[in-house]
């Protein structure tokens, strides 16, 4: 039977977009007894870590200092047991902002609707960029995306209280170099009175599932437990 | 079974190139690393590298970087290795060995590579 | 590079003997040390791997101890078919080292 071993989880501690000239900080998430971490830019080796001790730590943080565009991208990171490596991780997108200038977002018909009005955001950016991206904040995972030459719109259709929440956009420069966010506009949704005061306000950025959730074993676990389980052919 | 056979045995002229054959039996080609160790006659174990052969990745001892290519032929479960500029004190019995979660687990029989004028 | 430092380069005993052999690596490895076994014209044996498990198939009068640099492999009671030259090894970084090789002779 094939030896195997578990995927890799790969995460961005806070955010993925990172603003330009900060550090990013990401974390891969394998198994108690890895030896080794590598963390893979674009398809080659980025950087490598190693847990200490490896028996007592399940995934190692990769810090990227002074973020710029040529290190935006996807990311994607492996491990070893012994000498038998892991799949690959799933891909991140690591996308590095403030670059260049500021966009303005507006809402029509405003900021203040009634539940099933149509509403429509608008980004305008007035230097080179064709690609224009609308996220709510506490769900940066969820970005629409739309293109126009200096102003894209949004319409988001008959609204309910569902899509209460700030939005900021950006202006996109290539898919991992995005502008300065705008500043936020708050969309206040009235109506559903059932729903209006008692809907949860989202987690404001950054995102509550973009952290880091590796843990050190502090019980009396059985040392490198995992070379066992891999031990047939 | 596990097996791992090696190519025969290589004389080669100073500045020559050798390339070794490695094929495995037994398991899942993919699903294992495989590493290239030399041993020079009355000598210890040298690490030269190793490829996945899943991926393609490979990693080699930076001693060897600049003259050694280890490749993987996946639809033929052979792996391969390079040696370039070859010196006298490359004559050494070159291995190939499986990498597992338990380490250097299968050997291959050795190839003894013979670097002479 | 990791240096592995293995002692003594050579040894004589008889059967019977308890054996101990000793690898010290220049920085901690975390547990990440195997032993092999060779014999003249042969490719070498895995006996231990993860400094204290046996490979599969090993006997037990062979086994492994030690953690940080400083490792051991010890034979409680050698054997006629145990007289082979022994090397560790670490694999907890780029590049893997061997030490230097112990033989272990007939007296």
């Known amino acids: 039977p094939k030896q195997t071993l578990p995927k890799p989880i790969i995460r961005a501690e806070s955010t993925y977009m990172v603003p330009k000239e900060k550090q990013a900080t990401l974390c891969c998430q394998g198994s108690y007894g890895a030896v080794e971490y590598q963390l893979h830019f674009e398809g080659s080796l980025f950087a490598v870590e190693r847990p200490k001790p490896p028996e007592r730590i399940n995934g190692v943080k990769f810090h990227i200092p002074d973020m710029n565009s040529r290190k935006a991208g996807r990311y994607s990171c492996i491990y070893r047991v012994g000498e038998l490596w892991s799949e690959r991780s799933d891909l991140l997108d690591l996308v590095v902002t403030e670059m260049y200038d500021t966009p303005t977002l507006s809402v029509h018909p405003g900021p203040e609707v009634t539940s099933g009005e149509k509403v429509t955001f608008y980004c305008r950016l007035d230097t080179a960029t064709s690609m224009f991206l609308l996220l709510k904040e506490g769900r940066s995972r969820d970005v629409q995306r739309s293109y126009g030459k200096v102003q894209a719109e949004f319409p988001m259709g008959p609204v309910t209280t569902a899509h209460r929440g700030s939005y900021r956009c950006f202006g996109s420069y290539n898919n991992y170099a995005w502008s300065f966010p705008s500043e936020p506009v708050k969309l206040l949704v009235t109506g559903d009175i059932e729903n209006t005061s008692l809907a949860p306000t989202d987690p404001t950025f950054p995102d509550s599932w973009d952290t880091c959730l590796l843990t050190r074993e502090t019980g009396l676990q059985k040392d490198l437990a995992l070379w066992d389980h891999t031990a047939q052919n | 079974q596990v097996q791992l056979v090696q190519s025969g045995a290589e004389v080669k002229k100073p500045g020559a190139s050798v390339k070794v054959s490695c094929k495995a039996s037994?398991?899942?080609?993919?699903?294992?690393?495989m590493h290239w160790v030399r041993q020079a006659p009355g000598q210890g174990l040298e690490w030269i590298g190793y490829i996945n052969p899943s991926s393609g990745y490979t990693e080699y001892n930076q001693k060897f970087k600049d003259r050694t290519t280890i490749t993987a032929d996946k639809s033929t479960s052979t792996a391969y290795m390079e040696l370039s500029s070859l010196r006298s004190e490359d004559t050494a019995v070159y291995y190939c060995?499986?990498?597992?979660?338990?380490?250097?687990?299968?050997w291959g029989q050795g190839t003894l590579v013979t670097v002479s004028s | 590079d990791i240096q592995m430092t293995q002692s003594p380069s050579s040894l004589s005993a008889s059967v019977g003997d308890r054996v101990t052999i000793t690898c010290r690596a220049s920085e901690n490895i975390y547990s990440n040390l195997a032993w092999f076994q060779q014999k003249p014209g042969k490719a070498p044996k895995l006996l231990v791997y993860a400094a204290t498990n046996l490979a599969d198939g090993v006997p037990s009068r062979f086994s492994g101890s030690g953690s940080g640099t400083d490792y051991t492999l010890t034979i409680s009671s050698l054997q006629p078919e145990d007289f082979a030259t022994y090397y560790c090894q670490h694999f907890w970084g780029t590049p893997r080292t061997f030490g230097g090789g112990t033989k272990v002779e007939i007296k």
């Open positions: 037994g398991y899942t080609f993919t699903s294992f690393t």
């Open positions: 060995v499986r990498g597992s979660s338990r380490g250097f687990d299968y």
